[in-house]
């Protein structure tokens, strides 16, 4: 198991090519938002510490029909190493808080941000 | 509950245009993706485009010249329009929706009968 | 654009015994650890039905007795043991990029 964030993760975490790979959609994502990201669909928040890849993707896996997220979806999918399914959820979430998903994205990608800077990304 | 309906004009003329609607229920548009897909008799599946919930589309290559694809999210409804129509496009046309991530098509109409024909 | 060819284009298998239908990409339909390959089942008259999706994942209320293998360009469709209510024609179908496309269809019959 590898560390992320000093919490043991629950399966690899992407090495740096592949979670800046991530960084740069979410960047992406965020710069080339017109109107309201998936028509302002809301998720929910999640803890931004172990297991946290497979917690955002339980959270944006709710979301259909929003092309912007798709390569979200794969992405998050591919580093989490446990079949996720809409309407599944773990203890990772904030339940009782939901975001929109413009705003999920730019706070997965701040703490993205700051674990590439960190160098924990292997 | 999931339920798509297809109404198309049954007989169309070689050259002319095909318009089809697909009418839903149980859900909304802007959540989910339609997938147009056709059937020729006695042949296999032919996809043909989709709308997504965010209102972006893709197409199949070969017909993207002559084909569109639009929605009226409040009516519920999806519209398939199909320019200079030959024999060829003879088929059973069906509207089906998308389930979640992985976007396997997951709720059918029972399709509409298109026969062009002089 | 990714042409799915399936094989063989028709078989027919007893009852009880092993069905096995092959989907041949020609390209990988595989992207971040997945395989966006999906297998349908059509029944005469019918609109066709989700089996497998992701390659391998049984759609809810799909018999066990359905499974799907493969990855990159190479998948396969098991039906074992076939029951006389599988005969129908077989499709797989890959999202991984647009023009999504299908294969030929595999026809089964049950002797």
């Known amino acids: 198991l590898t560390c992320l964030g000093g919490f043991a993760s629950p399966g690899p975490v992407p090495p740096s090519t592949a979670l800046r790979e991530l960084i740069e959609e979410l960047v992406n994502i965020t710069q080339n938002q017109k109107a309201p990201l998936c028509n302002g669909s809301m998720v929910w928040s999640i803890n931004l510490t172990a297991g946290m890849y497979c917690a955002a993707l339980e959270s944006l896996i709710n979301v259909s029909g929003c092309s912007a997220i798709e390569k979200t979806q794969r992405m998050l999918s591919g580093f989490c190493p446990h079949k996720v399914s809409a309407g599944q959820f773990s203890s990772l979430h904030v339940r009782d808080t939901k975001i929109e998903v413009a705003q999920f994205v730019k706070d997965l990608l701040l703490h993205l941000k700051k674990l590439f800077r960190e160098g924990q990304f292997n | 509950q999931v339920q798509l309906k297809e109404s198309g004009p049954g007989l169309v003329a070689p050259s002319q245009s095909l318009s089809i609607t697909c009418t839903v229920s149980g859900f909304s548009l802007t959540g989910y993706n339609i997938n147009w897909v056709r059937q020729p008799p006695g042949k296999g599946l032919e996809w043909l485009g989709l709308i997504w919930g965010d209102g972006n589309t893709a197409f199949n290559s070969a017909l993207k010249s002559r084909l569109s694809i639009s929605k009226d999210n409040s009516k519920s409804q999806v519209f398939l329009k199909l320019n200079s129509l030959q024999t060829d496009d003879t088929a059973r046309y069906y509207c089906?929706?998308?389930?979640?991530?992985?976007?396997?098509?997951?709720?059918w109409g029972q399709g509409t009968s298109v026969t062009v024909s002089s | 654009n990714i042409v799915l060819t399936q094989s063989p284009a028709s078989l027919a298998v007893s009852l009880g015994q092993r069905a096995t239908i092959s989907c041949r990409a020609s390209?990988?339909?595989?992207?971040?650890?997945?395989?966006?390959m999906h297998w349908y089942q059509q029944k005469p008259g019918q609109p066709p039905k989700l089996l497998i999706y992701?390659?391998?994942n049984l759609e809810s209320g799909v018999p066990a007795r359905f499974s799907g293998s493969g990855s990159r360009t190479d998948f396969t469709l098991t039906i074992d043991p076939v029951e006389a209510d599988d005969a129908a024609t077989y499709y797989c179908q890959q999202n991984n990029e647009d023009p999504r496309t299908f294969g030929g269809g595999t026809k089964l019959e049950i002797k």
């Open positions: 992701l390659a391998s």
């Open positions: 089906a929706r998308d389930g979640y991530y992985p976007y396997a098509i997951k709720y």
């Open positions: 390209e990988t339909v595989d992207s971040y650890g997945n395989s966006f």
